[in-house]
Protein backbone atom coordinates (compact mmCIF):
# COMPACT_ATOMS: atom_id res chain seq x y z
CA UNK A 1 0.00 0.00 0.00
CA UNK A 2 1.02 3.63 -0.41
CA UNK A 3 2.04 4.87 3.01
CA UNK A 4 1.01 8.10 4.65
CA UNK A 5 -2.20 10.12 4.96
CA UNK A 6 -4.81 10.60 2.26
CA UNK A 7 -3.26 13.95 1.48
CA UNK A 8 0.39 12.92 1.12
CA UNK A 9 2.15 12.49 -2.19
CA UNK A 10 1.67 8.90 -3.29
CA UNK A 11 4.45 6.55 -4.28
CA UNK A 12 4.31 5.25 -7.84
CA UNK A 13 2.10 2.21 -7.27
CA UNK A 14 0.80 0.29 -10.23
CA UNK A 15 -2.98 0.21 -10.15
CA UNK A 16 -6.27 1.88 -9.32
CA UNK A 17 -9.63 0.29 -8.45
CA UNK A 18 -12.26 -0.38 -11.11
CA UNK A 19 -13.88 2.81 -12.42
CA UNK A 20 -11.02 4.91 -11.05
CA UNK A 21 -8.57 6.64 -13.36
CA UNK A 22 -4.84 6.68 -12.71
CA UNK A 23 -3.18 9.99 -13.44
CA UNK A 24 0.32 10.73 -12.28
CA UNK A 25 0.73 9.16 -8.85
CA UNK A 26 -2.95 9.27 -7.86
CA UNK A 27 -6.26 7.62 -8.61
CA UNK A 28 -9.27 9.78 -9.45
CA UNK A 29 -12.95 8.89 -9.41
CA UNK A 30 -15.33 11.01 -11.52
CA UNK A 31 -18.91 10.39 -10.44
CA UNK A 32 -21.76 9.72 -12.83
CA UNK A 33 -24.51 10.58 -10.36
CA UNK A 34 -24.97 13.80 -8.40
CA UNK A 35 -24.98 14.48 -4.66
CA UNK A 36 -24.71 17.47 -2.35
CA UNK A 37 -21.27 18.42 -1.03
CA UNK A 38 -21.53 16.56 2.29
CA UNK A 39 -22.81 13.37 0.67
CA UNK A 40 -20.01 13.58 -1.89
CA UNK A 41 -17.47 13.91 0.92
CA UNK A 42 -18.95 10.87 2.68
CA UNK A 43 -18.83 8.84 -0.53
CA UNK A 44 -15.12 9.51 -0.92
CA UNK A 45 -14.25 8.90 2.72
CA UNK A 46 -16.09 5.57 2.65
CA UNK A 47 -13.71 4.50 -0.13
CA UNK A 48 -10.52 5.48 1.68
CA UNK A 49 -10.23 8.59 -0.44
CA UNK A 50 -11.05 12.26 -0.13
CA UNK A 51 -12.89 14.88 -2.15
CA UNK A 52 -10.42 16.20 -4.67
CA UNK A 53 -7.72 18.40 -3.16
CA UNK A 54 -5.77 20.07 -5.96
CA UNK A 55 -2.14 20.77 -5.16
CA UNK A 56 -1.23 23.21 -7.92
CA UNK A 57 -2.17 24.75 -11.26
CA UNK A 58 -0.54 21.91 -13.16
CA UNK A 59 -2.75 19.28 -11.56
CA UNK A 60 -5.79 21.51 -12.07
CA UNK A 61 -5.03 21.95 -15.77
CA UNK A 62 -4.52 18.22 -16.26
CA UNK A 63 -7.82 17.38 -14.56
CA UNK A 64 -9.78 20.01 -16.49
CA UNK A 65 -9.06 18.06 -19.68
CA UNK A 66 -11.47 15.41 -18.36
CA UNK A 67 -14.16 17.88 -17.32
CA UNK A 68 -17.07 19.48 -19.18
CA UNK A 69 -19.30 22.48 -18.44
CA UNK A 70 -20.88 20.41 -15.65
CA UNK A 71 -19.59 21.24 -12.19
CA UNK A 72 -18.04 18.66 -9.87
CA UNK A 73 -17.67 19.01 -6.12
CA UNK A 74 -14.11 19.15 -4.81
CA UNK A 75 -12.63 19.29 -1.32
CA UNK A 76 -12.76 23.07 -1.02
CA UNK A 77 -14.78 25.14 1.44
CA UNK A 78 -15.02 28.74 2.57
CA UNK A 79 -14.46 28.84 6.32
CA UNK A 80 -13.21 32.40 6.84
CA UNK A 81 -11.31 31.99 3.60
CA UNK A 82 -11.16 29.30 0.97
CA UNK A 83 -9.38 26.20 2.27
CA UNK A 84 -8.86 22.69 0.99
CA UNK A 85 -9.96 19.74 3.11
CA UNK A 86 -6.32 19.13 4.09
CA UNK A 87 -6.30 22.58 5.69
CA UNK A 88 -4.19 24.33 3.07
CA UNK A 89 -5.38 27.67 1.66
CA UNK A 90 -6.46 28.14 -1.95
CA UNK A 91 -3.55 30.17 -3.27
CA UNK A 92 -2.93 29.24 -6.90
CA UNK A 93 -6.28 30.06 -8.49
CA UNK A 94 -9.27 32.34 -7.97
CA UNK A 95 -12.78 31.01 -7.40
CA UNK A 96 -15.91 32.58 -8.85
CA UNK A 97 -18.90 33.19 -6.61
CA UNK A 98 -22.16 35.13 -6.79
CA UNK A 99 -23.34 35.01 -3.19
CA UNK A 100 -22.10 34.84 0.38
CA UNK A 101 -24.12 31.63 0.86
CA UNK A 102 -21.92 29.82 -1.67
CA UNK A 103 -19.44 28.19 0.70
CA UNK A 104 -18.50 24.96 -1.09
CA UNK A 105 -16.16 24.64 -4.05
CA UNK A 106 -16.66 22.98 -7.42
CA UNK A 107 -14.70 22.69 -10.64
CA UNK A 108 -15.50 22.45 -14.34
CA UNK A 109 -13.48 22.81 -17.51
CA UNK A 110 -13.43 26.60 -17.07
CA UNK A 111 -12.17 26.75 -13.48
CA UNK A 112 -13.28 26.90 -9.87
CA UNK A 113 -16.79 27.95 -8.89
CA UNK A 114 -18.42 28.38 -5.49
CA UNK A 115 -21.87 26.96 -4.94
CA UNK A 116 -24.43 26.44 -2.21
CA UNK A 117 -23.36 23.19 -0.57
CA UNK A 118 -26.82 21.66 -0.91
CA UNK A 119 -26.86 21.71 -4.72
CA UNK A 120 -26.56 18.24 -6.30
CA UNK A 121 -23.45 18.07 -8.47
CA UNK A 122 -21.06 15.44 -9.75
CA UNK A 123 -17.94 15.01 -7.62
CA UNK A 124 -14.32 13.89 -7.85
CA UNK A 125 -12.53 11.67 -5.32
CA UNK A 126 -8.76 11.30 -5.10
CA UNK A 127 -6.65 8.61 -3.45
CA UNK A 128 -3.34 6.80 -3.52
CA UNK A 129 -3.13 3.79 -5.84
CA UNK A 130 -2.77 0.35 -4.32
CA UNK A 131 -0.39 -2.42 -5.37
CA UNK A 132 -3.00 -5.16 -5.05
CA UNK A 133 -6.18 -4.69 -7.12
CA UNK A 134 -7.84 -7.50 -5.10
CA UNK A 135 -7.96 -5.25 -2.06
CA UNK A 136 -11.05 -3.60 -3.60
Amino acid sequence: LCQGSNYSTCASCPSCPDRWMKYGNHCYYFSVEEKDWNSSLEFCLARDSHLLVITDNQEMSLLQVFLSEAFCWIGLRNNSGWRWEDGSPLNFSRISSNSFVQTCGAINKNGLQASSCEVPLHWVCKKCPFADQALF
Partner: antibody, heavy 118, light 108 residues
Protein backbone atom coordinates in the same frame (compact mmCIF):
# COMPACT_ATOMS: atom_id res chain seq x y z
CA UNK B 1 -36.14 23.74 -18.54
CA UNK B 2 -36.53 25.57 -15.23
CA UNK B 3 -39.92 27.23 -14.79
CA UNK B 4 -41.57 29.10 -11.95
CA UNK B 5 -45.31 29.50 -12.38
CA UNK B 6 -47.28 32.14 -10.51
CA UNK B 7 -50.96 33.09 -10.76
CA UNK B 8 -51.56 36.33 -12.64
CA UNK B 9 -53.58 38.25 -10.07
CA UNK B 10 -55.14 38.20 -6.62
CA UNK B 11 -57.76 40.61 -5.27
CA UNK B 12 -58.00 41.03 -1.50
CA UNK B 13 -59.69 43.32 0.98
CA UNK B 14 -57.77 45.54 3.42
CA UNK B 15 -56.90 43.68 6.63
CA UNK B 16 -57.18 40.29 4.96
CA UNK B 17 -54.45 37.76 4.14
CA UNK B 18 -53.28 36.33 0.86
CA UNK B 19 -51.30 33.16 0.11
CA UNK B 20 -49.30 33.39 -3.09
CA UNK B 21 -47.97 30.31 -4.85
CA UNK B 22 -44.91 29.62 -6.97
CA UNK B 23 -44.89 26.22 -8.67
CA UNK B 24 -41.45 25.02 -9.73
CA UNK B 25 -40.59 22.54 -12.46
CA UNK B 26 -37.60 21.41 -14.49
CA UNK B 27 -35.17 20.92 -11.59
CA UNK B 28 -34.75 19.34 -8.15
CA UNK B 29 -37.01 21.59 -6.08
CA UNK B 30 -35.38 20.79 -2.73
CA UNK B 31 -31.89 21.84 -3.83
CA UNK B 32 -32.16 25.57 -4.53
CA UNK B 33 -33.21 28.66 -2.57
CA UNK B 34 -36.45 30.37 -3.56
CA UNK B 35 -36.58 34.15 -3.07
CA UNK B 36 -39.59 36.45 -2.94
CA UNK B 37 -39.56 40.07 -4.12
CA UNK B 38 -42.10 42.91 -3.99
CA UNK B 39 -42.44 45.60 -6.64
CA UNK B 40 -44.97 48.40 -6.27
CA UNK B 41 -46.25 49.98 -9.51
CA UNK B 42 -43.53 52.13 -11.05
CA UNK B 43 -41.19 51.40 -8.13
CA UNK B 44 -38.07 49.32 -7.46
CA UNK B 45 -37.61 45.80 -6.16
CA UNK B 46 -37.68 44.84 -2.49
CA UNK B 47 -36.43 41.51 -1.17
CA UNK B 48 -38.95 39.92 1.20
CA UNK B 49 -37.06 36.77 2.09
CA UNK B 50 -35.98 33.35 0.94
CA UNK B 51 -36.55 29.70 1.79
CA UNK B 52 -34.51 26.56 1.24
CA UNK B 53 -37.05 23.83 0.37
CA UNK B 54 -34.74 20.96 1.37
CA UNK B 55 -34.86 21.97 5.03
CA UNK B 56 -37.57 24.66 5.07
CA UNK B 57 -35.16 27.11 6.70
CA UNK B 58 -35.67 30.72 5.74
CA UNK B 59 -34.47 34.30 6.06
CA UNK B 60 -36.62 37.42 6.16
CA UNK B 61 -36.17 41.11 5.55
CA UNK B 62 -36.95 42.70 8.94
CA UNK B 63 -39.41 45.02 7.19
CA UNK B 64 -41.64 42.04 6.29
CA UNK B 65 -40.80 39.59 9.07
CA UNK B 66 -43.96 40.14 11.10
CA UNK B 67 -46.39 39.82 8.18
CA UNK B 68 -44.82 37.38 5.70
CA UNK B 69 -44.48 33.63 6.13
CA UNK B 70 -42.61 31.51 3.60
CA UNK B 71 -43.40 27.82 3.30
CA UNK B 72 -43.00 25.00 0.79
CA UNK B 73 -44.84 21.86 -0.21
CA UNK B 74 -42.16 19.53 -1.54
CA UNK B 75 -44.72 16.99 -2.77
CA UNK B 76 -46.02 19.51 -5.31
CA UNK B 77 -42.75 21.46 -5.73
CA UNK B 78 -44.54 24.63 -4.72
CA UNK B 79 -43.34 27.56 -2.64
CA UNK B 80 -45.82 29.79 -0.83
CA UNK B 81 -45.77 33.23 0.68
CA UNK B 82 -48.55 34.18 3.06
CA UNK B 83 -48.99 37.91 3.64
CA UNK B 84 -51.14 39.15 6.53
CA UNK B 85 -52.93 42.38 7.45
CA UNK B 86 -52.81 43.78 3.95
CA UNK B 87 -53.11 47.51 3.25
CA UNK B 88 -53.14 49.52 0.06
CA UNK B 89 -49.34 49.81 0.37
CA UNK B 90 -49.16 46.07 -0.27
CA UNK B 91 -50.73 46.43 -3.72
CA UNK B 92 -47.82 45.30 -5.85
CA UNK B 93 -46.41 42.59 -8.08
CA UNK B 94 -44.84 39.78 -6.09
CA UNK B 95 -42.15 37.70 -7.77
CA UNK B 96 -40.57 34.41 -6.84
CA UNK B 97 -37.09 33.65 -8.15
CA UNK B 98 -34.60 30.80 -7.89
CA UNK B 99 -30.87 31.02 -7.35
CA UNK B 100 -28.21 29.09 -9.28
CA UNK B 101 -24.53 28.25 -9.12
CA UNK B 102 -23.09 30.69 -11.66
CA UNK B 103 -25.69 33.42 -12.11
CA UNK B 104 -27.36 34.68 -8.92
CA UNK B 105 -31.11 34.82 -9.72
CA UNK B 106 -31.50 33.65 -13.32
CA UNK B 107 -35.01 32.24 -12.99
CA UNK B 108 -38.03 34.40 -12.17
CA UNK B 109 -41.74 33.76 -12.13
CA UNK B 110 -44.04 36.05 -14.12
CA UNK B 111 -45.20 37.69 -10.91
CA UNK B 112 -48.58 37.90 -9.19
CA UNK B 113 -50.31 41.27 -9.13
CA UNK B 114 -51.94 41.70 -5.72
CA UNK B 115 -54.58 44.41 -5.53
CA UNK B 116 -55.76 45.46 -2.07
CA UNK B 117 -59.04 47.27 -2.31
CA UNK B 118 -62.32 47.49 -0.45
CA UNK C 1 -28.87 46.91 5.73
CA UNK C 2 -26.71 47.85 2.77
CA UNK C 3 -28.51 50.63 0.90
CA UNK C 4 -27.82 50.82 -2.85
CA UNK C 5 -28.30 54.20 -4.51
CA UNK C 6 -28.49 54.37 -8.29
CA UNK C 7 -27.96 57.43 -10.44
CA UNK C 8 -29.33 58.90 -12.49
CA UNK C 9 -32.89 57.80 -11.81
CA UNK C 10 -33.81 58.45 -15.44
CA UNK C 11 -31.56 58.97 -18.43
CA UNK C 12 -32.15 59.50 -22.11
CA UNK C 13 -29.80 58.57 -24.94
CA UNK C 14 -29.77 58.44 -28.72
CA UNK C 15 -28.88 55.23 -30.58
CA UNK C 16 -25.11 54.89 -30.86
CA UNK C 17 -24.35 56.92 -27.74
CA UNK C 18 -22.28 55.60 -24.85
CA UNK C 19 -24.08 55.59 -21.49
CA UNK C 20 -22.95 54.86 -17.96
CA UNK C 21 -25.09 54.40 -14.87
CA UNK C 22 -23.80 54.05 -11.35
CA UNK C 23 -24.65 52.17 -8.18
CA UNK C 24 -23.29 53.26 -4.80
CA UNK C 25 -23.49 51.10 -1.69
CA UNK C 26 -23.72 52.39 1.87
CA UNK C 27 -21.13 49.79 2.89
CA UNK C 28 -18.54 47.87 0.91
CA UNK C 29 -19.68 44.98 -1.30
CA UNK C 30 -17.41 42.23 -2.60
CA UNK C 31 -17.25 42.55 -6.38
CA UNK C 32 -18.32 38.89 -6.62
CA UNK C 33 -21.63 39.77 -5.01
CA UNK C 34 -22.74 42.84 -6.98
CA UNK C 35 -25.17 42.14 -9.82
CA UNK C 36 -27.30 44.00 -12.37
CA UNK C 37 -30.79 43.14 -13.63
CA UNK C 38 -32.67 44.45 -16.63
CA UNK C 39 -36.43 44.88 -16.49
CA UNK C 40 -38.59 45.89 -19.39
CA UNK C 41 -42.10 47.27 -18.91
CA UNK C 42 -44.56 44.58 -17.88
CA UNK C 43 -41.92 41.84 -17.68
CA UNK C 44 -39.99 40.07 -14.93
CA UNK C 45 -36.43 41.19 -14.19
CA UNK C 46 -33.61 39.35 -15.96
CA UNK C 47 -30.11 38.82 -14.64
CA UNK C 48 -27.96 40.99 -16.90
CA UNK C 49 -24.48 41.32 -15.40
CA UNK C 50 -23.30 39.21 -12.47
CA UNK C 51 -20.31 39.49 -10.17
CA UNK C 52 -19.65 43.08 -11.33
CA UNK C 53 -18.46 42.34 -14.85
CA UNK C 54 -19.71 38.99 -16.16
CA UNK C 55 -22.39 39.18 -18.84
CA UNK C 56 -25.31 36.80 -18.41
CA UNK C 57 -26.03 34.47 -21.29
CA UNK C 58 -27.33 36.22 -24.44
CA UNK C 59 -26.44 39.70 -23.17
CA UNK C 60 -24.85 41.73 -26.01
CA UNK C 61 -21.14 42.53 -25.76
CA UNK C 62 -21.86 46.28 -25.85
CA UNK C 63 -22.73 45.95 -22.14
CA UNK C 64 -20.01 45.97 -19.52
CA UNK C 65 -19.75 46.36 -15.78
CA UNK C 66 -17.02 47.52 -13.45
CA UNK C 67 -16.36 48.73 -9.94
CA UNK C 68 -15.26 47.74 -6.46
CA UNK C 69 -15.95 48.55 -2.83
CA UNK C 70 -18.90 50.91 -2.70
CA UNK C 71 -18.94 52.16 -6.30
CA UNK C 72 -20.09 50.18 -9.33
CA UNK C 73 -21.20 51.02 -12.85
CA UNK C 74 -22.92 49.56 -15.89
CA UNK C 75 -21.87 50.89 -19.29
CA UNK C 76 -23.39 50.46 -22.74
CA UNK C 77 -20.80 51.32 -25.39
CA UNK C 78 -23.30 52.03 -28.15
CA UNK C 79 -26.95 52.16 -27.12
CA UNK C 80 -29.59 50.45 -29.22
CA UNK C 81 -33.38 50.84 -29.14
CA UNK C 82 -33.82 47.40 -27.53
CA UNK C 83 -31.81 48.56 -24.49
CA UNK C 84 -34.70 50.74 -23.29
CA UNK C 85 -35.43 49.33 -19.83
CA UNK C 86 -34.88 49.87 -16.14
CA UNK C 87 -31.62 48.55 -14.72
CA UNK C 88 -31.30 47.53 -11.09
CA UNK C 89 -28.14 46.78 -9.13
CA UNK C 90 -28.36 44.21 -6.35
CA UNK C 91 -26.03 43.02 -3.61
CA UNK C 92 -25.80 39.41 -2.41
CA UNK C 93 -23.13 39.98 0.22
CA UNK C 94 -25.45 39.60 3.20
CA UNK C 95 -29.05 39.58 4.40
CA UNK C 96 -31.22 41.33 3.62
CA UNK C 97 -30.50 41.26 -0.09
CA UNK C 98 -31.01 44.77 -1.40
CA UNK C 99 -31.70 46.35 -4.78
CA UNK C 100 -30.99 49.85 -5.97
CA UNK C 101 -33.89 52.10 -6.89
CA UNK C 102 -33.21 51.56 -10.59
CA UNK C 103 -32.06 53.63 -13.55
CA UNK C 104 -34.61 53.99 -16.32
CA UNK C 105 -32.98 54.25 -19.73
CA UNK C 106 -35.05 55.91 -22.42
CA UNK C 107 -34.05 55.94 -26.07
CA UNK C 108 -34.63 59.17 -28.04
Amino acid sequence: QVQLQQPGAEFVKPGASVKLSCKASGYTFTSYWIHWMKQRPGQGLEWIGNIYPGRSNNNYNEKFKNRATLTVDTSSSTAYMQFRSLTSDDSAVYYCARDATVEPLPYWGQGTLVTVSA
Amino acid sequence: ENVLTQSPAIMSASPGEKVTMTCRASSSVSSNYLHWYQQKSGASPKIWIYSTSNLASAVPARFSGSGSGTSYSLTISSVEAEDAATYYCQQYSGYPLTFGGGTKLEIK
